[in-house]
């Protein structure tokens, strides 16, 4: 299995994301928009605007996501979108709350197994690669409310039921309280707290913060792994350099990232992944010889 | 209006590969998942596998794991099919196929279908 | 895998005359049932959905019944163009999986 898989590698063994955080609310700027006498006036914020074709592109990833998931065709994509559209039209989008998806969050209701989570912090794709292998683990994205979402922005605007296209709030030079920002907090929260038995994280070990406080992983995930369900988080750290033979699982943030684990009476545990390439060809090809022997 | 249009008849050696196309117009490519299906001559129907082109995740039945590779370019808005190690009973007609979304999950839209014939 | 027996496995009918044909699931799927008729050198055609749910441009001659684990198709009036091959399918659960086909024939 994977214990195999790692071993191979060479990977040590130590006992021991969606970015955001950050409060301010920003006014925005107001531009004229339409023509004609009368101007008509938007918010002019400093991220990108909705994604084009938002609802049509939410609708179709529902179905899909239902004709992929079986288990999942009891759910009703247009209450799904309804719901999802009334967390956030014609409200202000820095005045958003977790109160707003609460009607989404229980229309994707859904069950994944606990002790098969894998959570991950900037170093998505290769997450994502791993569970379309290794197929009874799951990322946030890997269920139906985080598949919906995986890599839109959007947003609207205070009493129209318009869609904004083309600006929405930036987290850091805007406000927190966006659209974007308070879904994946949400998911992400409800995602951990339902976590058991051995949670599993993938992260970035090119980045100069492997474990980084601010991201949704650092800031959301951590903290709402329930201590009483959550034996141990075993971190996957992913070397990026062919010839990176550096025990990273050393990295001072990671050893933050212990400190904050233990502190919650959840076990911690590392590995080097230094070869990820040859990691998802092993979790493919478990019999492959170079897999079953050390390296 | 939405058609699958598959290339065109393929003839393979035993061990070769052969990959086929399958491009699709009338609709967004990225909103379907699209499945493969093998008919061999005279015979019923096998499913094969899906791919979600927005993502490149795919899905296959057991036989065919070793067998079949779904691949999609959202580019050009076409799915393939690579058939590798080619034995004489995968000579078979090949189609790629799509649901509705309106018509439960049935498979509303058919490509015309692909002839594989493997010879040596 | 779900196992889709269909019969008869081929039949000869007459102009004008009624058809049936049935479909049995190995295992419960509910209504996630498709029927198909496919012409010689063509792409299968999906006639039923869900059981029991006509397809757009099917003409009303053609009707399905059936859930959980017996299902049927069924033609009346039979005319020259509904020679065929059918075909019943599964959609409860991946695999998805096919019965082996039904020729109808004239006679």
């Known amino acids: 299995g994977l214990n195999d898989i790692f071993e191979a590698q060479k990977i040590e063994w130590h006992e021991g994301s969606h970015h955001h955080h950050h409060h301010h609310h920003g006014s925005g700027s107001l531009v004229p928009r339409g023509s004609g006498s009368v101007p008509r006036w938007r918010q002019q914020w400093s991220g990108p605007g909705t994604t084009k074709r938002f609802p049509e592109t939410v609708l179709a990833r529902c179905v899909k996501y239902t004709e992929i998931h079986p288990e999942m065709r009891h759910v009703d994509c247009q209450s799904v979108w309804d719901a999802f559209k009334g967390a956030f039209i014609s409200k202000h989008p820095c005045n958003i709350t977790e109160e707003d998806y609460q009607p989404l969050m229980k229309l994707g209701t859904q069950t994944v197994p606990c002790n098969k989570i894998l959570l991950w912090s900037r170093i998505k794709d290769l997450a994502h690669q791993f569970t379309q292998v290794q197929r009874d683990m799951f990322t946030l994205e890997d269920t139906l409310l985080g598949y919906l979402a995986d890599d839109l922005t959007w947003c609207g605007e205070f009493n129209t039921s318009k869609i904004n296209y083309q600006s929405c709030p930036d987290w850091r030079k805007d406000c927190s309280n966006n659209p974007v920002s308070v879904f994946w907090k949400t998911v992400s929260r409800r995602f951990a707290e339902a976590a058991c038995d051995v949670v599993h994280v993938m992260l970035n070990g090119s980045r100069s913060k492997i474990f980084d406080k601010n991201s949704t992983f650092g800031s959301v995930e951590v903290h709402n792994l329930q201590p009483e369900k959550v034996q141990t988080l075993e971190a996957w750290v992913i070397h990026g350099g062919r010839e990176d033979s550096r025990d990273l699982c050393q990295d001072p943030t990671i050893k933050e990232l212990e400190s904050i684990i233990s502190k919650r009476n959840i076990q911690f545990s590392c590995k080097n992944i230094y070869r990820p390439d040859k990691f998802l060809q092993c979790v493919k090809n478990p019999e492959d010889s170079s897999c079953t022997s050390e390296i | 209006e939405v058609q699958l249009q598959q290339s065109g008849p393929e003839v393979g050696r035993p061990g070769s590969s052969v990959k086929i196309s399958c491009k699709a117009s009338?609709?967004?490519?990225?909103?379907?998942?699209m499945h493969w299906v093998k008919q061999s001559p005279g015979q019923g129907l096998e499913w094969i596998g899906w791919?979600?082109?927005?993502?490149?995740?795919?899905d296959y039945a057991e036989k065919f794991k070793k067998k079949a590779t779904l691949t999609a370019d959202t580019s050009s808005s076409t799915a393939y099919i690579q058939l590798s190690s080619l034995a004489s009973e995968d000579t078979a007609t090949y189609f790629c196929?799509?649901?509705?979304?309106?018509?439960?999950?049935?498979?509303?839209?058919w490509g015309q279908g692909t002839l594989v014939t493997v010879s040596s | 895998d779900i196992q889709m027996t269909q019969s008869p496995a081929s039949l000869s009918a007459s102009l004008g005359e009624t058809v049936t044909i049935e479909c049995r699931a190995s295992e419960d799927i509910y209504s996630n049932l498709a029927w198909y008729q496919q012409k010689p050198g063509n792409s299968p055609q999906l006639l039923i959905y869900d059981a029991n749910s006509l397809a757009d441009g099917v003409p009303s001659r053609f009707s399905a019944s059936g859930s959980g684990t017996q299902f049927s198709l069924k033609i009346n009036s039979l005319r020259s163009e509904d020679v065929a091959s059918y075909f019943c399918q599964q959609y409860n659960n991946y695999p998805y999986t096919f019965g082996a086909g039904t020729k109808l024939e004239l006679k």
């Open positions: 009338g609709y967004t490519f990225t909103d379907y998942i």
């Open positions: 791919i979600d082109p927005e993502y490149g995740r795919t």
């Open positions: 196929a799509r649901s509705a979304h309106t018509t439960g999950f049935g498979f509303a839209y």
